[in-house]
Amino acid sequence: SQVSQNCHNGSYEISVLMMGNSAFAEPLKNLEDAVNEGLEIVRGRLQNAGLNVTVNATFMYSDGLIHNSGDCRSSTCEGLDLLRKISNAQRMGCVLIGPSCTYSTFQMYLDTELSYPMISAGSFGLSCDYKETLTRLMSPARKLMYFLVNFWKTNDLPFKTYSWSTSYVYKNGTETEDCFWYLNALEASVSYFSHELGFKVVLRQDKEFQDILMDHNRKSNVIIMCGGPEFLYKLKGDRAVAEDIVIILVDLFNDQYFEDNVTAPDYMKNVLVLTLSPGNSLLNSSFSRNLSPTKRDFALAYLNGILLFGHMLKIFLENGENITTPKFAHAFRNLTFEGYDGPVTLDDWGDVDSTMVLLYTSVDTKKYKVLLTYDTHVNKTYPVDMSPTFTWKNSKLPNDITGRGPQ
């Protein structure tokens, strides 16, 4: 039902869903800190623009007794319960921040008349693509898929002279929320990735993965998986790996690879790590002091959600436009705003664009080095290291099918 919004007469409220089920196991206190830091910045920016208005956040907590799994499995109902709570209290803000679980976002979007914008730190799945009033501030699965297809097809780089058309995907069902949806998108038979590949098989058992590493009859040299180096080690250990195997390890929200003292373990030499370009530095901010590098992106997305709202509010107020309109609800896309850590670009569908970075392990220095970057906004790859010190023969990535000549 239609809920009146606390969103006029110089007072603008943000409804923040504080859900027990979350894409990342981040204490809600840290997310509150991120939101509050964002509010301080927004208030300052509005004041500097001569706009004398009040901006606040209302944190809506769900009943932890009912929804207490902590992960996203029971989030579908939790999201709707929170919306019901908002409805009963007649306390809807101008914008809804949260949820982060794909299940809950999809269901909430489906079951409500969304005449207000919804900003999510998560909602990675393909089912949340192309939603008119949903903005996602962490890289969704679609962006990953487009990178992989672009990279597979690339054959004119000094270190990649073959197009690839095959892959194994390792997916055992224990993945984190982001990985679950990334791999789900690669697995889906109707997805862009599946459509563009000639051969793709999902490996679901540890043994299947381990057998492929030395199987002379394997159908592809390329294996995609998602997680951190420790996850790979648990699976691979110190097993021998055929010299033309390439493991692509998707680990987007982990900037530890860029830290000065990090040395790549030996088991990473056959691995290309796909991660996001690190932030300029969040280390000095009050909200990020308690965060691990892997959690920074999640809290930052909450903070940036507040800054995005402030950006849109400023534009609409300066233009004398009403905030409680479909126009406002549909405006959170195809724009660049000043995020906490620099400019943030949203595509035509409200999804964040970013620079993805593909790293390799230098056999000389045992350090992670940047091989190439990929700009999701323009779907373009930029080589960074033209003569990488790879483990692979001739310092070039092998063909994806053993024994097949140049493509």
Epitope: D156, P278, G342, V370, T373, M386
Partner: antibody, heavy 117, light 106 residues
Amino acid sequence: EVQLVQSGAEVKKPGSSVKVSCKASGGTFSSYAISWVRQAPGQGLEWMGGIIPIFGTANYAQKFQGRVTITADKSTSTAYMELSSLRSEDTAVYYCARGHYYYMDVWGQGTTVTVSS
Amino acid sequence: DIVMTQSPATLSVSPGEGATLSCRASQSVSSNLAWYQQKPGRAPRLLIYGASTRATGIPARFSGSGSGTEFTLTISSLQSEDFAVYYCQQYNNWPTFGGGTKLEIK
């Protein structure tokens, strides 16, 4: 509008080292490549190496490998190029240039380095 | 290294006329080619990247074409400020520059 301001001219003895700085102002520093290009008197342009400050590690042209070190300080938006074991043929104008990877859209004013005994 | 060869070394043209500068790569560089203009005592200035895309603020009389190994910079109607040295540069591999073409007033 991004500007790159380089340190002043240097006169060096053969065998010594020189360190040239390049300070960026008015735009994004960290996520662009900063390249160093030199030009000997009356000659063409020669790429020495580059760094993307946000990633930290530099890449070098084969010819300069082991003799050049490129670094960047994100906190001051400054890149540095140090060339060691100088010889007379290193006499040149040294430019820093900001690029979208390896084409260069903004250039510093150049720093003249003279190597002479 | 990829060797870039520019021709001619010197080109004499009258103001108002057009000029065509050539650049050849020793192996394919796809469309990863840039053109620069340099005047005496000044830093180079980016004109074209991606073989044919004009950089910000570059007049429409400058155009680039080609891909693979053969590239051309065309200046349609020469102004007095266009007389300078022009360099091509590939960035398909570690960057290398051509030797330059000096465009002088006839």
